[in-house]
């Protein structure tokens, strides 16, 4: 079991009784880790490792946990209040505009360009023109010396549901 899981992440049925825990809705809504019953009288806990809810809600079902696709690694497991976090395997990346799949990073830069940024799970290698220092996209780096790749944004929950 991953060390990322805390007691708070565990649904009540994992900690105590085997049956799903019920509580009363607050202003017609149920807290994270729960969904509302069809009659609206109860909040029913999500099933750990199977489904989740991240906010106050009036969902009739918790949302199904994402399963990491082949070509992805699981950074953290699905809990009752947080979806699985998946990340592209080394050598591949996920673009913001096409989050459905991990794409292979380029192995090198086009002729006349030099690499200034490495392949990361969220970006391809970055190339600039040797002479001008202009990026492939046409942007000009603020500093003309070698640009180091930034750590990027945190990994997001992966996009394919199982």
């Amino acid at each position: 079991e991953s060390a990322l899981i805390t007691q708070q992440d565990l649904a009540p049925q994992q900690r105590a009784a085997p049956q799903q825990k019920r509580s009363s809705p607050s202003e017609g809504l149920c807290p994270p880790g729960h969904h509302i019953s069809e009659d609206g009288r109860d909040c029913i806990s999500c099933k750990y490792g199977q489904d989740y809810s991240t906010h106050w809600n009036d969902l009739l079902f918790c949302l199904r946990c994402t399963r990491c696709d082949s070509g992805e690694v699981e950074l953290s497991p699905c809990t009752t209040t947080r979806n699985t976090v998946c990340q592209c395997e080394e050598g591949t990346f996920r673009e913001e505009d096409s989050p459905e799949m991990c794409r292979k990073c380029r192995t090198g830069c086009p002729r006349g360009m030099v690499k200034v940024g490495d392949c990361t799970p969220w970006s391809d290698i970055e190339c600039v023109h040797k002479e001008s220092g202009t990026k492939h996209s046409g942007e000009v780096p603020a500093v003309e010396e070698t640009v180091t790749s930034s750590p990027g944004t945190p990994a997001s929950p992966c996009s394919l549901s199982g």
């Epitope: 997001s156 996009s159 549901s161």
Partner: nanobody
Framework: EVQLLESGGGEVQPGGSLRLSCAAS????????VGWFRQAPGKEREFVSA????????YYAESVKGRFTISKDNAKRTLYLQMSSLRAEDTAVYYC???????????????????WGQGTLVTVKP
């Protein structure tokens, strides 16, 4: 081209109500979850509420729980946010947004949304 047009903002006194609307030009509106976000002056854009593609079930930020209600009319391609018991801290520009392709069933973070309206200003003051 995806176009989202918010309306319904304005100035209201604390405790008052407003109903925001968001008209969408995209045919996939009826099969997509949709969300409301807000951005107060000098602050980051924050999640307010999101609703499932079919309009059955929604998420709410803790700060608006019990005061705001999101709804969706797929036939009219319109999203609504009914806001009541408004407070000074609700003052912000409110944006409706559609998620990027392939995101989760009910996205609730800014980065999961790729299409944004221009926003409508809500001001709550005595």
């Amino acid at each position: 081209e995806v176009q989202l047009l918010e309306s319904g903002g304005g100035e209201v006194q604390p405790g008052g109500s407003l109903r925001l609307s968001c008209a969408a030009s995209v045919s996939t509106f009826g099969t997509s979850p949709v969300g409301w976000f807000r951005q107060a002056p000098g602050k980051e854009r924050e999640f307010v509420s999101a609703i499932r593609w079919d309009g059955v079930g929604a998420y709410y930020a803790e700060s608006v729980k019990g005061r705001f209600t999101i709804s969706k009319d797929n036939a009219k391609r319109t999203l609504y946010l009914q806001m009541s018991s408004l407070r000074a801290e609700d003052t912000a520009v409110y944006y409706c947004a559609l998620p990027r392709r392939g995101e989760s069933e009910l996205p609730s973070t800014v980065k999961e949304y790729g299409y944004w309206g221009q926003g409508t200003l809500v001001t709550v003051k005595p």
